[in-house]
C-alpha cells in the first residue's frame, strides 16, 4: 500500500507588471499529475511583505493570483498542491512548499527618499499630494510621481507638478475616473547627478482621505420657548448627504461652549429666554458608512444671532 504523494507547483514566481505594488503570483501545475487526471487540484498560497507577522492565505484552483504589496519592503510567498480525499480514495494529501521572493533593488540611501508625503482628496473631486525633499539632497534633485489603480492600462506620471525652488514638491492630479473604493498606488522616485535617490511607494484608497468643503447656509429657527433649531446645508459637490458627519461648535453669550457631533443637517439646542447672543459654526467629515477614515473640513463661516427675540424672526445668512 504505497503512500500517495504529489509534487509542489512548478515555476512559481512573482511578476511585477509595473503597477507600483500590484503584483502577479503565478505558477504551473506540478509534475506527474497523470495519476490524478480525474481530480481538481487546488493550491494553497501564502504570501506577505517581509517583516509582516502574518501570512495572507488563499486557496485557488487557478494558476495565478493578484494582490497589492508594499514595494518599500520585500515580498515572500510559498505555495503547495492540495489533493482532496476524493482524489486519493483516502485522506487529504499536500505537497511540500515551493517558495519565492521578490524585491526591488533599492537605489540610494533611505534619507534621500521624499519626506512627509501627504495626500488629500478634496471634496471627493481633486487629489493633491505634497512632499518634502529627502534629507541632505542637493537642489539638482528632482522627484517624479507615478500612479496606478485598477482600470488604468499602465502607470501614469503626474502632469501637473507643484514646484518650489525649481523642485517638484507635489502633484495636482487630473480627474480620476472610477478610482475610489480600490487601492491607489503611488511611487515617487527621483534623480540627481550627484547620488542615487531612493524610491518611495504608497498605497491608499481615495475615499479614506477625503476632505470635504464646509457646510453652507447656516440658519436658526425658534422651535419653542426653550428650543432653537440650528440648520445647515451639505456643501456643493459629489458627496451625498448620507455620507456626512458634522461637528458643531456653539457659543452662547461669549461663555458657554457646546460641541456636538451629529449625522443630520440639524441640531436642536436647549436655551433660556435670557440668551442674548448665539453663534455657531459647523464642519463636515465623510462618515463610516462611506469610508474607513476621513479629514474634517474647515469650519464654516460663523452664523450669529443677537439682541432680538429669536421667536420673531428666522435668520438666514
Amino acid at each position: 500500500d504505497t503512500e500517495i504523494k504529489v509534487n509542489p507547483p512548478q515555476d512559481f514566481e512573482i511578476v511585477d507588471p509595473g503597477y507600483l505594488g500590484y503584483l502577479y503570483l503565478q505558477w504551473q501545475p506540478p509534475l506527474s499529475l497523470d495519476h490524478f487526471k480525474e481530480c481538481t487540484v487546488e493550491y494553497e498560497l501564502k504570501y506577505r511583505n517581509i517583516g509582516s507577522e502574518t501570512w495572507k492565505t488563499i486557496i485557488t484552483k487557478n494558476l495565478h493570483y493578484k494582490d497589492g504589496f508594499d514595494l518599500n519592503k520585500g515580498i515572500e510567498a510559498k505555495i503547495h498542491t492540495l489533493l482532496p480525499w476524493q482524489c486519493t480514495n483516502g485522506s487529504e494529501v499536500q505537497s511540500s512548499w515551493a517558495e519565492t521572493t521578490y524585491w526591488i533593488s533599492p537605489q540610494g540611501i533611505p534619507e534621500t527618499k521624499v519626506q512627509d508625503m501627504d495626500c488629500v482628496y478634496y471634496n471627493w473631486q481633486y487629489l493633491l499630494c505634497s512632499w518634502k525633499p529627502g534629507i541632505g539632497v542637493l537642489l539638482d534633485t528632482n522627484y517624479n510621481l507615478f500612479y496606478w489603480y485598477e482600470g488604468l492600462d499602465h502607470a501614469l506620471q503626474c502632469v501637473d507638478y507643484i514646484k518650489a525652488d525649481g523642485q517638484n514638491i507635489g502633484c495636482r492630479f487630473p480627474y480620476l475616473e472610477a478610482s475610489d473604493y480600490k487601492d491607489f498606488y503611488i511611487c515617487v522616485n527621483g534623480s540627481s547627478e550627484n547620488k542615487p535617490i531612493r524610491s518611495s511607494y504608497f498605497t491608499f484608497q481615495l475615499q479614506n482621505i477625503v476632505k470635504p468643503l464646509p457646510p453652507v447656509y447656516l440658519t436658526f429657527t425658534r422651535e419653542s420657548s426653550c428650543e432653537i433649531k440650528l440648520k445647515w446645508s451639505i456643501p456643493l459637490g459629489p458627496i451625498p448627504a448620507r455620507c456626512f458627519d458634522y461637528e458643531i461648535e456653539i457659543r452662547e453669550d461669549d461663555t458657554t461652549l457646546v460641541t456636538a457631533t451629529v449625522e443630520n443637517e440639524t441640531y436642536t439646542l436647549k436655551t433660556t429666554n435670557e440668551t442674548r447672543q448665539l453663534c455657531f459654526v459647523v464642519r463636515s467629515k465623510v462618515n463610516i458608512y462611506c469610508s474607513d477614515d476621513g479629514i474634517w473640513s474647515e469650519w464654516s463661516d460663523k452664523q450669529c444671532w443677537e439682541g432680538e427675540d429669536l421667536s420673531k424672526k428666522t435668520l438666514l445668512r
Partner: antibody
Framework: EVQLLESGGGLVQPGGSLRLSCAAS????????LNWVRQAPGKGLEWVSA????????FYADSVKGRFTISRDNSKNTLYLQMNSLRAEDTAVYYC??????WGAGAFDYWGQGTLVTVSS | DIQMTQSPSTLSASVGDRVTITCRAS??????LAWYQQKPGKAPKLLIY???SLESGVPSRFSGSGSGTEFTLTISSLQPDDFATYYC??????????FGQGTKVEIK
Amino acid sequence: EVQLLESGGGLVQPGGSLRLSCAASGFTFSRDALNWVRQAPGKGLEWVSAISGSGGSTFYADSVKGRFTISRDNSKNTLYLQMNSLRAEDTAVYYCAKVRYGWGAGAFDYWGQGTLVTVSS
Amino acid sequence: DIQMTQSPSTLSASVGDRVTITCRASQSISSWLAWYQQKPGKAPKLLIYDASSLESGVPSRFSGSGSGTEFTLTISSLQPDDFATYYCQQYDTYPPITFGQGTKVEIK
C-alpha cells in the same frame, strides 16, 4: 443518510461569547471539509468560516477574523464555532454545511437546519 | 475578493413559465459556481455545481450554464414548488467564499 444538526444558538449581549456545535452523521466525517454560513434576518447568505477534513487548515471571513474560531473533533463527529466579542451585526441563523468536493470549501451539498444567534442588549 | 451579482433581484412568473436567472462574477471563476434554492425558514438546497452539473435528486427542469464571468440558472417549466429564493456561489478562490445577493421568484 447525511445529517447535520446545529445547536448552541441563543440570545447573548454585545461583547459576549457563544459556542455553536454541529453534530454530523451519515458520512465519513473526518474526510470532508465543513463550513459555517450565516443569514441575517431578511438578508442573503454570508460565508463565515471553513475547515479542512483533518482540521489542519482553517479559513475565515474578514468580518469575523480574530473573533471566531472554527474547530472539529473527528472522534465525536462534531464541528464547532467559538464566537467571541459578539456584535449586533452577528445576529443571524448559522448553518453548518458539508463540502461536496474540495479541500476547505466548495459547493455545499448538505446543510443543517440552522441555529439562531441573537446579539442584543 | 470576487463579487457575485445576481439579476434580477425579484422575478414574477407563472406556473409553466421558462425562468432564467443570471449571475455575474467580478473576475473569471472558470466553472466553479453553484446554485442553491432556499424556501422561507429552511436551509438552502444545492441544485447545480460546477456551473452545469445537476445535483443528485434535483428535477431535470433545472439547468445551469456559463463559464468565466457569466452564468445562468434556467427553470424550463416553473412548478408550484419552485417559488423560492435562488443564490449563486463561487468557490474558485477563497477566502472568502462569496454568494450572490439572491433572486426571489414569486407568483405573478
